[in-house]
Interface confidence: low
């Protein structure tokens, strides 16, 4: 799997999970989240050569097409596969609220 | 939806469905498929600005991050959403076989 265990241990130009820390206030302009101040969101990036973690038949076809027709703009893209939620604390007035924001953290990637 | 009905009728730089015809023999080097000779595979391409058909909370966060930090390499990518199968005819010896290849045709796109 193109996850932290593999990607953070290997120097990989191809599609892989990349570390990314997001500070809510500085990076997103969100001042409503009290805790945490930021989180390890991660992101997916890298090339998708033929058969590199292809997600579907179409992405396999597309990467093969791209190999044979390298001048073409049609090629698969490295995107998130498994995502996890993030628990946040915010306030409505003086009342603390805890909420789970779904699909906030990328855990692994794929070529799609 | 970022499908043919919308994308093929509008000139759209942002993430959208793009037409792509693939000739099995010429474009993929596949000689084993007898019919069809090729098919409209389509593909997804285009920019993913903030909130343009974002797939997940993470892709929304990433596109906002990318807007505020334009020098960053972290940004969502335009990929396939709905896919359809393709029915093909091929031969094993002289015996014709009909098979459905899953996820061969892209019908719509998303930013992920």
């Amino acid at each position: 799997a193109l996850d932290a265990a593999y990607c953070f241990r290997n120097v990989q130009d191809n599609c892989c999970l990349r570390p990314l820390y997001i500070d809510f206030k500085r990076d997103l302009g969100w001042k409503w989240i009290h805790e945490p101040k930021g989180y390890n969101a991660n992101f997916c990036a890298g090339a998708c050569p033929y058969l590199w973690s292809s997600d579907t038949q179409h992405s396999r076809v597309l990467s093969l097409y791209n190999t044979i027709n390298p001048e073409a703009s049609a090629s698969p893209c490295c995107v998130s596969q498994d995502l996890e939620p993030l628990t946040i604390l915010y306030y409505i007035g003086k009342t603390p609220k805890i909420e789970q924001l779904s699909n906030m953290i990328v855990k692994s990637c794929k070529c799609s | 939806a970022l499908d043919a009905a919308y994308c093929f009728r509008n000139v759209q730089d942002n993430c959208c469905l793009r037409p792509l015809y693939i000739d099995f023999k010429r474009d993929l080097g596949w000689k084993w498929i007898h019919e069809p000779k090729g098919y409209n595979a389509n593909f997804c391409a285009g920019a993913c600005p903030y909130l343009w058909s974002s797939d997940t909370q993470h892709s929304r966060v990433l596109s906002l991050y990318n807007t505020i930090n334009p020098e960053a390499s972290a940004s969502p990518c335009c990929v396939s959403q709905d896919l359809e199968p393709l029915t093909i005819l091929y031969y094993i010896g002289k015996t014709p076989k009909i098979e459905q290849l899953s996820n061969m045709i892209v019908k719509s796109c998303k930013c992920s």
Epitope: G29, W30, I92, E99, S102 | Y50, L51, Q57
Partner: antibody
Framework: QVTLRESGPALVKPTQTLTLTCTFS??????????VGWIRQPPGKALEWLAH???????SYSTSLKTRLTISKDTSKNQVVLTMTNMDPVDTATYYC????????????WGQGTLVTVSS | DIQMTQSPSSLSASVGDRVTITCRAS??????LNWYQQKPGKAPKLLIF???SLQSGVPSRFSGSGSGTDFTLTISSLQPEDFATYYC????????FGQGTKVEIK
């Protein structure tokens, strides 16, 4: 993809209550962080923020109009309703609803606006 | 409440001109400042958020700067479609719009 549309009476009498509905598509108010706000603009004058409602039912109102305003949402119908009591001719304005994403405070998508005239 | 003061209230300019509009907050609002463009009979359109971030789809001739109490919207080379009214908006505490700046053809 994101659309908002305001609806309500074009004419109301002084002292009456105005009820405006914002019907939207392309997003959901059940999504964490999503909000809808109301803004008005008297003819030839500046924009004035009125009220806000968020996915979690958090509401905020303009200080000067707080006693006259009520905002509510119907998530299943993709609608936000604003009521304004004790209407006066000075409340004649174009009323807009707009989407606010993640408490960012800025409105990235707006309705086309509905003109409300207060007159007897 | 925080007051937002825009200047000038109107200006005349020609196509190709560099145009600068300022917005001053009555107290520190950090970078919680947005800019909108409005054409007659139309809804406002978001140009800049967070004082300097360009909204997607907005031409790069528009730029924003400032922090604290003083902010600027700059149009580097005025185009025919830029003749409109521009509003600043603070979102640090509640919401307040400026009174607007009308950009007219000279």
């Amino acid at each position: 993809q994101v659309t908002l549309r305001e609806s309500g009476p074009a004419l109301v009498k002084p002292t009456q209550t105005l009820t405006l509905t914002c019907t939207f598509s392309g997003f959901s108010l059940s999504t964490s962080g999503m909000g809808v706000g109301w803004i008005r603009q008297p003819p030839g004058k500046a924009l004035e923020w009125l009220a806000h409602i968020y996915w979690n039912d958090d509401k905020s109102y303009s200080t000067s109009l707080k006693t006259r305003l009520t905002i509510s949402k119907d998530t299943s119908k993709n609608q936000v309703v604003l009521t304004m009591t004790n209407m006066d001719p000075v409340d004649t304005a174009t009323y807009y609803c707009a989407r606010d994403f993640y408490y960012s405070g800025y409105f990235d998508s707006w309705g086309q606006g509905t003109l409300v005239t207060v007159s007897s | 409440d925080i007051q937002m003061t825009q200047s000038p209230s109107s200006l005349s300019a020609s196509v190709g001109d560099r145009v600068t509009i300022t917005c001053r907050a009555s107290q520190d609002i950090s970078n919680y400042l947005n800019w909108y463009q409005q054409k007659p009979g139309k809804a406002p359109k978001l140009l800049i958020f967070g004082a300097s971030s360009l909204q997607s789809g907005v031409p790069s001739r528009f730029s924003g700067s400032g922090s604290g109490t003083d902010f600027t919207l700059t149009i580097s080379s005025l185009q025919p479609e830029d003749f409109a009214t521009y509003y600043c908006q603070q979102t640090n505490t509640m919401n307040t719009f400026g009174q607007g700046t009308k950009v007219e053809i000279k």
